[in-house]
Interface confidence: low
């Protein structure tokens, strides 16, 4: 969106000015600007910041907007993720397999076959848990085969995600304890896909991926991450730069415009028919008539 003021020109203030286009911008920023007429060919070659010309307009990457994708957005949507994950670090002892040095080598055929069997067994064990995603073996060691592995869980994001995952981790503990108690070697014979040592089952650690708006904001802002912050309104996080109006960190550029660049937010001051404006926040007005007489 381009706003035109017939009698207003913009002039850069000292050092590195960066400007956010529209002082009343909202989190939703237009990503495209249509161009008609003879100048369009020229515009096509000038799309900035990774923008691409589609024949009519510059299509801008997420962080940018404007006719030439020259403007950095002042607000980034950091709505909650679709899913939240949890990882349980577990150790079980498999007694039905003899340990060999080859099992230490994750690219060996022995390891691959063991991994396939173990994964298949765990898929059966955890089959009733909707949040179960799979297992990931991290290490195999001697004694018969001590399997250090992660059980991966995932659930759709809801405000209750923590309770859902907490419940799932409890069910995982119950099921692995049950199977390692039931599937055991009898007279050195294993009648199941895998057998376990009842006393070799341990849960070391449970990690639930936290929904971290600050981290999401920093990542999505990429090289501008140092200047974007998260502020909350009605418990909803907003990832904003100081160029977004209406927040506690908002930069007041008075009659000027705030613009973001690699080196941070700065005010771009305007010149009207009657005044020049200057200063870090464009708060110093000089009447032209006083200069020109």
């Amino acid at each position: 969106r381009t706003t035109s003021f017939p009698t207003v020109t913009t002039t850069a203030v000292p050092t590195n000015t960066t400007i956010k286009s529209n002082p009343t911008s909202t989190p939703t920023v237009p990503r495209t600007t249509t161009c008609f007429g003879d100048g369009c060919q020229n515009t096509a070659s000038r799309c900035k910041n990774g923008g691409t010309w589609d024949g009519l307009k510059c299509q801008c990457p997420n962080l940018y907007y404007g006719e030439l994708c020259e403007e950095v957005v002042s607000s980034i949507d950091i709505g909650p993720p679709e899913t939240i994950s949890a990882q349980m670090e577990l150790t079980v002892t498999v007694t039905s397999v003899k340990f060999t040095e080859e099992l230490k080598n994750h690219s060996s055929q022995e390891f691959q076959e063991f991994k396939q069997t173990f994964t298949e067994q765990m898929n059966i064990v955890y089959s009733g848990i909707p949040e179960y995603v799979g297992v990931n073996i991290t290490k195999l060691r001697l004694g018969s085969v001590v399997v250090e592995h992660d059980v991966l869980l995932r659930t759709k994001y809801t405000p209750e995600y923590k309770t859902v995952l907490d419940n799932a981790t409890e069910v995982v503990k119950e099921k692995i304890t049950k199977v390692t108690t039931q599937q055991i070697m009898i007279n050195d014979i294993c009648s199941d896909m895998m057998c376990f040592n009842t006393t070799g089952t341990q849960v070391q650690n449970i990690t639930v991926t936290q929904y971290d708006p600050e981290e999401d904001c920093r990542k999505m802002a990429k090289e501008y991450g140092d200047y974007f912050v998260v502020e909350y309104r009605d418990q909803k996080p907003y990832c904003i730069s100081p160029c977004e109006p209406g927040f506690s960190v908002s930069k007041n550029c008075n009659l000027g415009k705030c613009q973001m660049s690699l080196s941070g937010p700065q005010c771009l001051c305007v010149t009207t028919e009657t005044h020049w404006y200057s200063g870090e926040t464009c708060n110093q007005g000089t009447q032209k008539s006083l200069v020109y007489g």
């Epitope: 000292p14 050092t15 590195n16 990774g50 990457p61 997420n62 990542k219 990429k222 090289e223 991450g225 140092d226 660049s261 690699l262 080196s263 941070g264 937010p265 700065q266 870090e280």
Partner: antibody, heavy 120, light 113 residues
Framework: QVQLVQSGAEVKKPGASVKVSCKAS????????MHWVRQAPGQGLEWIGM????????RLNQKFKDRATLTVDKSTSTAYMELSSLRSEDTAVYYC?????????????WGQGTLVTVSA | DIVMTQSPDSLAVSLGERATINCKSS????????????LAWYQQKPGQSPKLLIY???TRESGVPDRFSGSGSGTDFTLTISSLQAEDVAVYYC?????????FGAGTKLELR
């Protein structure tokens, strides 16, 4: 420990293309931009551009806009720089470099360099 | 584009003496919001990749000896090696990390006298 390992030296004829690879390890590949810088024999350093592994967005120095293509393969943590329509003045050592944490603009880690020779 | 001009092109200094390399930018690299200057210095030895020494004009990279220091503000910057060691013989480059495209100085070759 961060490591950027580049592909081997190349000899190309004028007009041809070259694709240099840079395999990253020792850090979270998708958080950092990957930059490319070149250095002609006995000359200074020249920034070509950068790409971001999370979404493959790339940013090029205008000088290389029409000839350089930067890509990434997240599955192998490898970045690529392809330069087309080669000319003799493209003879240089090409470096991939990783920026310092929290910045995309100065370089904490560098690949060992790939010498590209353009000669008829 | 911001043009970076280094001087001198080459410099010969005796062991233990002070070496001073200058770098001038065509526009200010000072960010008035945080009062940081967006300039870095690199060292490149023959046949090696560049090595980061200093960023933000004066912040020494971890592991860099304290005989290396950076100073300056706005458009004029200096890299100083307080007491030259034999291993400091190299080419030194300044680089602005203020705006794209990122640009480097042409380099200063530091030799032993």
């Amino acid at each position: 420990q961060v490591q950027l390992v580049q592909s081997g030296a190349e000899v190309k004829k004028p007009g041809a293309s070259v694709k240099v690879s840079c395999k990253a390890s020792g850090y979270s590949f998708t958080i950092y931009w990957m930059h490319w810088v070149r250095q002609a024999p006995g000359q200074g350093l020249e920034w070509i551009g950068m790409s971001h592994p999370s979404d493959s967005e790339s940013r090029l120095n205008q000088k290389f806009k029409d000839r350089a293509t930067l890509t990434v393969d997240k599955s192998t943590s490898t970045a690529y720089m392809e330069l087309s329509s080669l000319r003799s003045e493209d003879t240089a050592v090409y470096y991939c470099s990783r920026p310092y944490y929290g910045s995309s603009a100065w370089f904490a880690d560098w690949g060992q360099g790939t010498l590209v020779t353009v000669s008829a | 584009d911001i043009v970076m001009t280094q001087s001198p092109d080459s410099l010969a200094v005796s062991l233990g003496e002070r070496a001073t390399i200058n770098c001038k930018s065509s526009q200010s690299l000072l960010n008035s919001s945080n009062q940081k200057n967006y300039l870095a210095w690199y060292q490149q030895k023959p046949g090696q990749s560049p090595k980061l020494l200093i960023y933000f004009a004066s912040t020494r990279e971890s592991g860099v000896p304290d005989r290396f220091s950076g100073s300056g503000s706005g458009t004029d910057f200096t890299l100083t090696i307080s007491s030259l060691q034999a291993e400091d013989v190299a080419v030194y480059y300044c680089q602005q990390h203020y705006s794209f495209p990122l640009t480097f100085g042409a380099g200063t070759k530091l030799e032993l006298r």
